[in-house]
Interface confidence: low
């Protein structure tokens, strides 16, 4: 169970994990107090016969994919949480772990 | 520019929009004060040669897809906002339109 890591200079065409910083302010999600931005990563590339595991997306996660239309078939298969400071429904500021916010591994579904 | 609408009883195998209610509390996104749940819809199905337009995901959007692994290739091509009560980075409770929260149309990328 593995996945490729790439960067913007990579020539890899297969499904790969790329670095991406999500800026909550830019996306309009400004009820998040902290962090204002974080390294989320994203998946992009061609899907052939590898990376068959698909991570079940059970949370709101960012899908910004600057590498184009191949992205949606190449999806996260392992994700991890980040600690966030946010506002809860009881009008309290909460510090907690929000699951499935960082892409650790990519694969094809 | 069009898309298919299906429901849980549908025999359609192609990329289609299905009804789905997102429950923010269940997903742990409890800094959203209201609504606690809303009709988000989702995309699922096989992608052949139709529905070529891909919606550019520029916001954190829910990707829960109970119909399985075909989902990521079949993505929203038109989305609309919902009004939400939420907490912003200036520590104010805001009533605002959050974009790209409801799937109006599905297509293949």
């Amino acid at each position: 169970d593995f996945g490729l890591d790439c960067d913007e200079h990579s020539t890899e065409s297969r499904c790969c994990r790329y670095p991406l910083t999500v800026d909550f302010e830019a996306f309009g999600w400004d009820w998040i107090i902290a962090p204002k931005r974080y390294k989320a990563n994203y998946c992009s590339g061609e899907c052939e016969f590898v990376f068959l595991q698909k991570y079940p997306h059970t949370h709101l996660v960012h899908q910004a994919n600057p590498r184009g239309s191949a992205g949606p078939c190449c999806t996260p298969t392992k994700m991890s949480p980040i600690n966030m400071l946010y506002f809860n429904g009881k009008e309290q500021i909460i510090y907690g772990k929000i699951p499935a916010m960082v892409v650790d591994r990519c694969g094809c579904s | 520019d069009f898309g298919l609408d299906c429901d849980e009883h549908s025999t359609e195998s192609r990329c289609c929009r299905y009804p789905l209610t997102v429950d923010f509390e269940a997903f742990g996104w409890d800094w959203i004060i209201a609504p606690k749940r809303y009709k988000a819809n989702y995309c699922s199905g096989e992608c052949e040669f139709v529905f070529l337009q891909k919606y550019p995901h520029t916001h954190l959007v829910h990707q829960a897809n109970p119909r399985g692994s075909a989902g990521p290739c079949c993505t929203p091509t038109k989305m609309s906002p919902i009004n939400m009560l939420y907490f912003n980075g200036k520590e104010q409770i805001i009533y605002g339109k959050i974009p790209a929260m409801v799937v109006d149309r599905c297509g293949c990328s």
Partner: antibody, heavy 124, light 107 residues
Framework: QVQLVQSGAEVKKPGASVKVSCKAS????????MHWVRQAPGQGLEWIGN????????NYNQRFKARATLTTDTSTSTAYMELRSLRSDDTAVYYC?????????????????WGQGTLVTVSS | DIQMTQSPSSLSASVGDRVTITCKAS??????LSWFQQKPGKAPKSLIY???RLVDGVPSKFSGSGSGQDYTLTISSLQPEDFATYYC?????????FGQGTKLEIK
């Protein structure tokens, strides 16, 4: 029962400051936003701002931002509205009001409890 | 700031009458509108929130409607205790802004 009791009437000279108090009882003070609204004699209602006692965060109407300060004392469950550099047109009844969140939709709140009002008269 | 224009500014009516007060916003306020009743020397009392939802304990003779920029408060059958001044409030945007009020008097 939930109650907001405000301080008594004040008479101030132009240029002075006034600090109106609003003592809450019958509920968890830190969990609800407190709003301040004023009403000049024979006039309409004007929103001054609000404060969240849990963390002291406040929001102001820009018209009052330079002169008004909203604070809270959680140990006594009291909210305060201070207005500086008073002018004759600040003569008004000042109200505190609790924002009650009903919790079923994006703007489901209303002012469910008001203080009795504090008349501030500014006169030379 | 969003301007709220209430009309009429005063209104004479008789017991049993049905009356309508309107409030127009300077922009779309997404139904984030409340209505208040105020009697002389008293604090305002909330009647309606979110344009058409009745506050707990408020009689059903009060109703609200509208969307976008235009909203109305209707009192279906006036009783002596209903003669008062009524205000609208928009909560779509800070600063919150009130209408100038409608004084409802006995004819």
């Amino acid at each position: 029962q939930v109650q907001l009791v405000q301080s008594g009437a004040e008479v101030k000279k132009p240029g002075a400051s006034v600090k109106v108090s609003c003592k809450a009882s019958g509920y968890s003070f830190t969990g609800y936003f407190m709003h301040w609204v004023r009403q000049a004699p024979g006039q309409g209602l004007e929103w001054i701002g609000n404060i969240y006692p849990y963390n002291g965060v406040s929001n102001y109407n820009q018209r009052f931002k330079a002169r008004a300060t909203l604070t809270t004392d959680t140990s006594t469950s009291t909210a305060y509205m201070e207005l500086r550099s008073l002018r004759s047109d600040d003569t008004a009844v000042y109200y505190c009001a609790r924002r009650y969140y009903y919790g079923t939709g994006p703007a489901d709140w209303y002012y469910d409890v008001w203080g009795q009002g504090t008349l501030v008269t500014v006169s030379s | 700031d969003i301007q709220m224009t209430q009309s009429p500014s005063s209104l004479s009516a008789s017991v049993g009458d049905r009356v309508t007060i309107t409030c127009k916003a300077s922009q779309d306020i997404n139904s984030y509108l409340s209505w208040f009743q105020q009697k002389p020397g008293k604090a305002p009392k909330s009647l309606i929130y979110r344009a058409n939802r009745l506050v707990d304990g408020v009689p059903s003779k009060f109703s609200g409607s509208g969307s976008g920029q235009d909203y109305t408060l209707t009192i279906s059958s006036l009783q002596p205790e209903d003669f008062a001044t009524y205000y609208c409030l928009q909560s779509d945007e800070f600063p919150l802004t009130f209408g100038q009020g409608t004084k409802l008097e006995i004819k």
